[in-house]
């Protein structure tokens, strides 16, 4: 997260760290007792590595009573996700067992009504991604409030030049932005999950290259079918 601040500890009980061989790889969001939603591209290079999900965490390194690392029983990328596009960049991870819920571990309601969030709406994005252009990784969860950007502006040639489909949304990126390592994490508007940080190699913090988020409402049928 660029231009953000340390989150209040455990105030986002839905927040997950998707880990590869014990190290933070991507963000994720607990959407059901046994399911975490993340980004499909996160597992592209995972190959033979061990994928796990950390829940109930604020610090990645320090012991915390609510922290628990879960193995992944099943990883379900969206069937249409492809390495070279930002489209359909969703991944559902089934935990090896139902998460132990409590004040620091709780699923987040997700948007089912397929309607665009109004431009200018302030939404919260959180993650353990890099906090500066030098690539410094934080130990504790960071967050930032970002205004939603209308799709027409995001599709301008000087922004994302037509790449933003109706299944994607954008948020402003003027110094405050999601960045590498935040992919798969939640964009939360009014207490509801609206978007998932896409995992492209986008430049961060440049106002002409807004953050891109997959709209979960557009994938309600797929999410329901996997969770069923």
């Amino acid at each position: 997260i660029l231009g953000g601040r340390e989150a209040e500890a455990h105030a986002r009980p839905y927040m997950a760290s998707v880990q590869l061989n014990g190290a933070h790889l991507c963000g994720g969001v607990l959407v059901a007792e046994q399911w975490v939603l993340s980004a499909a591209h996160c597992l592209e290079d995972a190959a033979d590595g061990k994928v796990q999900v950390l829940l109930g965490a604020h610090s990645l390194s320090q012991p915390e009573p609510s922290k628990r690392l879960y193995d992944v029983l099943r990883a379900v990328p969206h069937p249409d996700s492809q390495p070279d596009t930002i489209d359909h960049d969703l991944l559902l991870l089934q935990l090896s067992e139902k998460a132990t819920l409590g004040p620091a571990v709780r699923p987040l309601p997700w948007q089912r009504v397929d309607r665009d969030v109004a431009p200018g709406t302030l939404c919260d994005v959180a993650g353990w991604g890099i906090v500066n252009h030098a690539g410094r990784r934080p130990d504790s969860l960071q967050h930032v409030l970002l205004p939603v950007l209308d799709r027409a502006t995001c599709n301008r040639r000087t922004h994302h030049d037509g790449a933003i489909t109706e299944r994607l949304m954008c948020a402003e990126s003027n110094r405050r932005d999601s960045c590498k390592g935040d992919s798969g994490g939640p964009l939360v508007c009014g207490g509801v999950l609206e978007g998932v940080v896409t995992s492209g190699s986008r430049v961060c913090g440049n106002r002409k290259k807004p953050g891109i988020y997959t709209r979960v409402a557009s994938y309600a049928a797929w999410i329901d079918s996997v969770l069923a």
């Epitope: 431009p119 209308d150 799709r151 027409a152 502006t153 599709n155 301008r156 040639r157 000087t158 994302h160 030049d161 037509g162 790449a163 933003i164 109706e166 430049v203 440049n206 002409k208 290259k209």
Partner: antibody
Framework: EVQLVESGGGLVQPGGSLRLSCAAS????????MNWVRQAPGKGLEWIGD????????DYNADFKRRFTFSLDTSKSTAYLQMNSLRAEDTAVYYC?????????WGQGTLVTVSS | DIQLTQSPSSLSASVGDRVTITCRSS???????????LEWYQQKPGKAPNLLIY???NRFSGVPSRFSGSGSGTDFTLTISSLQPEDFATYYC?????????FGQGTKVEIK
């Protein structure tokens, strides 16, 4: 399939007004800026300006700012170009073109002739 | 405003020829985001323009590989490696980096 269809062109007297329409189909109208470009007979392409179909924000080429106005009817997925105080030198084919990707999608153009 | 000057204004060539059109801008067209929004369009009589090249050197989908773009800063080039009968048209460069966006005056490619 993305389609842009202009209409409303024709013969108009100097000093007169005309409103051109650009009806869009095959995509979500509010997801892309609409631009207007014109081409005088035998001449090059000239950018008139653009409009954001979500916010209504506009940008005009300074040469057109006083006499030309953009508007929208999002319920009809249509953009409009209102042209006032027309002059002989406004005689041209007028195009609408969607921005994103680049100017990949254009209407067929509508001819405006300003003559007495 | 940024002026784009194309040369030549017109040229005569034969099928199979290699054709080069240049476009010079009155100032740099590198955008504040680091990209250069220089595009090339092809227009045939009575038709709307067609996008060929975007961001200096990227071919738009469906555009034949004989079309290529290059350049940087203020000097840009469109090359047709082997002219085909359907390539006889007028070509325009365009800059989208700075408002007002502008087109070059055009280069007409005619049959020799």
């Amino acid at each position: 399939e993305v389609q842009l269809v202009e209409s409303g062109g024709g013969l108009v007297q100097p000093g007169g007004s005309l409103r051109l329409s650009c009806a869009a189909s095959g995509y979500k109208f509010t997801s892309y800026y609409m631009n207007w470009v014109r081409q005088a007979p035998g001449k090059g392409l000239e950018w008139i300006g653009d409009i954001n179909p979500v916010t209504g924000d506009t940008d005009y080429n300074a040469d057109f700012k006083r006499r030309f106005t953009f508007s929208l009817d999002t319920s009809k997925s249509t953009a409009y170009l209102q042209m006032n105080s027309l002059r002989a030198e406004d005689t041209a084919v007028y195009y609408c073109t969607r921005e994103g990707p680049s100017f990949a999608y254009w209407g067929q153009g509508t001819l405006v002739t300003v003559s007495s | 405003d940024i002026q784009l000057t194309q040369s030549p204004s017109s040229l005569s060539a034969s099928v199979g020829d290699r054709v080069t059109i240049t476009c010079r801008s009155s100032q740099t067209i590198v955008h504040s985001n680091g990209d250069t929004y220089l595009e090339w369009y092809q227009q045939k009589p009575g038709k709307a323009p067609n996008l060929l090249i975007y961001k200096v050197s990227n071919r738009f989908s469906g555009v034949p590989s004989r079309f290529s773009g290059s350049g940087s800063g203020t000097d840009f080039t469109l090359t047709i490696s082997s002219l085909q009968p359907e390539d006889f048209a007028t070509y325009y460069c365009f800059q989208g980096s700075h408002v007002p966006v502008t087109f070059g005056q055009g280069t007409k490619v005619e049959i020799k």
